[in-house]
């Protein structure tokens, strides 16, 4: 059985404020069935950027459709960024249970903000 | 407008247990890990514990073994359970909200807990 | 496990003074220092992060500076609500987190 693998090929994206964020996630397989969730930063205080299970995430939308049979494409959009929005993003998955259990992390993406542009 | 409220200090005797609890506001709080930090009379500050937004749950070296941390989400409520108090306990606990960086940005009020015999 | 090292542990100024508050880490922590402000029966307060960054809300006449393991906070021209107890914390040493035992600004 090949191991699973997170994947988030950019290390680094810059983004002006205003605009949106594109934060790129892929597994190389459906199997073991978990979710998937994305946090901002690596340590216990870790923040919670999105769950696709559960939770209000009024910027943050999926880039495609999580309900589809068969996807392997967990990316994000967050709209509006500000400079608060910078930080290392983590997409991390989980095995279903009671409670999920975390499996595996992808590298991390670096997000930057830039000055709106005058 | 953030809001952690504190409440369940008291007075007990040394060995006995007590439940602190922490009422969040204004934020999405099963977004956030949180903390209890406490202060002792006249010192500084002190970690006691965390849980992360999904559960895992750590302990200061003084604490490991007696206090339990919990957190209801449906209720935006932070607790601990302290539990084989001793004296050495005494202090104003804090319910604090901490970020991704590991900053403590919101503070409750405080709640204080006396073991005395 | 890090150790934070504050000094002095009182320090004495009249408003209008330069207040230079030090923190001491144990070993390197680049620039992952935090610092802190308490009034009397107040929760702490976030003043500064990442050794330089300012809080929101928080007065340019607070700013940090430092690397490694010395670090400092100074306060230009102190103001009267400035006078309390100050804490670095290492950002990132968890768990568990640490804080400086603090510094007291009191009024000369």
């Known amino acids: 059985e090949e191991e699973l693998q997170v994947i988030q090929p950019e290390k680094s994206v810059s983004v002006a404020a205003g605009d949106s964020a594109t934060l790129n996630c892929t597994v190389s397989s459906l199997i073991p069935v978990g979710p998937i969730q994305w946090f901002r930063g690596a340590g216990p205080g870790r923040e919670l950027i999105y769950n696709l299970k559960e939770g209000h995430f009024p910027r943050v939308t999926a880039v495609s459709d999580p309900t589809k049979r068969n996807n392997m494409d967990f990316s994000i959009r967050i709209s509006n960024i500000t400079p608060a929005d910078a930080g290392t993003y983590y997409c991390v998955k989980f095995r279903k249970g009671s409670p999920d259990v975390e499996l595996k992390s992808g590298a991390g993406t670096e997000l930057s903000v830039r000055a709106k542009p005058s | 407008d953030v809001q952690l409220v504190e409440s369940g200090g008291g007075v007990v005797r040394p060995g006995e247990s007590l439940r602190l609890s922490c009422a969040a506001s204004?934020?999405?709080?099963?977004?956030?890990?949180m903390n209890w930090v406490r202060q002792a009379p006249g010192e500084g500050l002190e970690w006691v514990s965390l849980i992360s937004v999904t559960a895992t749950t750590y302990y200061a070296d003084s604490v490991k073994g007696r206090f339990t941390i919990s957190r209801d989400n449906s209720k935006n409520t932070l607790y601990l359970q302290m539990n084989s108090l001793r004296a050495e306990d005494t202090a104003v606990y804090y319910c604090?909200?901490?970020?991704?960086?590991?900053?403590?940005?919101?503070w409750g009020l405080g709640t204080l807990v006396t073991v005395s015999s | 496990e890090i150790v934070l090292t504050q000094s002095p542990g009182t320090l004495s100024l009249s408003p209008g003074e330069r207040a230079t508050l030090s923190c001491r880490a144990s070993?390197?922590?680049?620039?992952?220092l935090a610092w802190y402000q308490q009034k009397p029966g107040q929760a702490p307060r976030l003043l500064i992060y990442?050794?330089?960054t300012r809080a929101t809300g928080i007065p340019d006449r607070f700013s940090g500076s430092g690397s490694g393991t010395d670090f400092t906070l100074t306060i230009n021209r102190l103001e009267p609500e400035d006078f309390a107890v100050y804490y670095c914390q290492h950002q990132y040493d968890w768990p568990p987190y640490i804080f400086g035992g603090g510094t007291k600004v009191e009024i000369k």
């Open positions: 990442n050794t330089v």
């Open positions: 604090a909200k901490v970020t991704w960086n590991n900053l403590f940005d919101y």
């Open positions: 070993q390197p922590i680049d620039s992952y």
């Open positions: 204004g934020f999405t709080f099963s977004n956030f890990a």
